[in-house]
Interface confidence: medium
């Protein structure tokens, strides 16, 4: 029950995370104009991974796509790639995890297969989350670098004259959405991996103890109770659960040194 809950919760958390990664990737507010020095501005600029927008004092907004591919900064291209890889891995992970869910029965799928699928989707979610966090962090680092560079330029004008014309950009809402979404996908992936351990069939087998009390003879097999630790090998090629156990008909009482009258 706990395994099903952990798996289900992991799936839901990852689903929310991937939806967030998609939303962040599509959002225009990756970087927004810093209004610290000029809160009452006629124009508000903000930029996304795919287009740049301007909002005027009237409230009217216009966006323009980056129609060039070669002219864009390498860092922006890298961020785009990381986010897309994150989305693709996450989407595949979701698809795999749907079939891996314990509450969903598909034909006669073994628990071991479900466990493997759960682990696969979990790893995919973890990588997806890491891609999103990496992408957002790279963009944030780029912003911080540019922000301080433009701040330095602002106050080192000609003859120490302050230049306030330079537009500085700060963190946009998409960055926070991306960080949270990446984190959720990562957590969901970890939960799926934990659930996988619970889904995997137990390797601990117990060989049955054979007791026989018919008439005067009691057949007792010492050492018949053996927990398989994985170190001993099944040398006699018997069925693993056979364990030397016998039915009433099979067991014959031959005199031996272990027989007590």
């Amino acid at each position: 029950m706990a395994v099903t809950a952990c798996q289900g919760l992991g799936f839901v958390v990852s689903l929310i995370g991937i939806a967030g990664i998609i939303a962040a990737t599509c959002m225009d507010q990756w970087s927004t104009q810093d209004l610290y020095n000029n809160p009452v501005t006629a124009v508000f600029n903000y930029q996304g991974l795919w287009r740049s927008c301007v909002r005027e004092s009237s409230g009217f907004t216009e966006c323009r796509g980056y129609f060039t591919l070669l002219g864009l900064p390498a860092m922006l291209q890298a961020v785009r790639a990381l986010m897309i890889v994150g989305i693709v891995l996450g989407a595949i992970g979701l698809l795999v995890s749907i079939f891996a869910l314990k509450c969903i029965r598909i034909g006669s799928m073994e628990d071991s297969a479900k466990a493997n699928m759960t682990l696969t989707s979990g790893i995919m979610f973890i990588v997806s989350g890491l891609c999103a966090i990496a992408g957002v962090s790279v963009f944030a680092n780029m912003l911080v670098t540019n922000f301080w560079m433009s701040t330095a330029n602002m106050y080192t004008g000609m003859g120490g004259m302050v230049q306030t014309v330079q537009t500085r950009y700060t963190f946009g809402a998409a960055l926070f959405v991306g960080w949270v979404a990446g984190g959720l996908t990562l957590i969901g992936g970890v939960m799926m991996c934990i659930a996988c351990r619970g889904l995997a069939p137990e390797e601990t087998n117990y060989k049955a103890v054979s007791y026989h009390a018919s008439g005067h003879s009691v057949a007792y097999k010492p050492g018949g109770f053996k927990a398989s630790t994985g170190f001993g090998s099944n040398t006699k090629n018997k069925k693993i659960y056979d364990g030397g156990a016998r039915t009433e008909d099979e067991v014959q009482s031959y005199p031996s040194k272990h027989d007590y009258v």
């Epitope: 006629a42 124009v43 600029n45 301007v54 909002r55 005027e56 004092s57 009237s58 409230g59 009217f60 216009e62 323009r64």
Partner: nanobody, 127 residues
Amino acid sequence: EVQLAESGGGSVQAGGSLRLSCAASRYISSSYCMSWFRQAPGKEREGVAAISTRGGSTYYVDSVKGRFTIFQGNAGATVYLQMNSLKPEDTAMYYCAAAEGLCGWGGWESAVRFGSWGQGTQVTVSS
């Protein structure tokens, strides 16, 4: 490309008013930045005021703020520049210019951004 024609220029005493109009050859449906520039003899062309045809956001150079008003006509094909409290330093040739996109993209005060220009109308302010 949009064809532009200015009118309304003339001579006026300092402190007087004038209204310049800029008529576009067609109704501007998409977003355009309509700007008024002026060029005094021996000086560079400078942006005076601008308006975004969509949204109606307005922009002014510091020297005319509070004195000049830019606005659109109801038809959407005419832009006006209402000039009050005129000064002798406002004497110049006034040009109307149009560029695609909101003025907020920047460069409304720079002639480089604008592809469509009118012939200009002369404004003379005497003291």
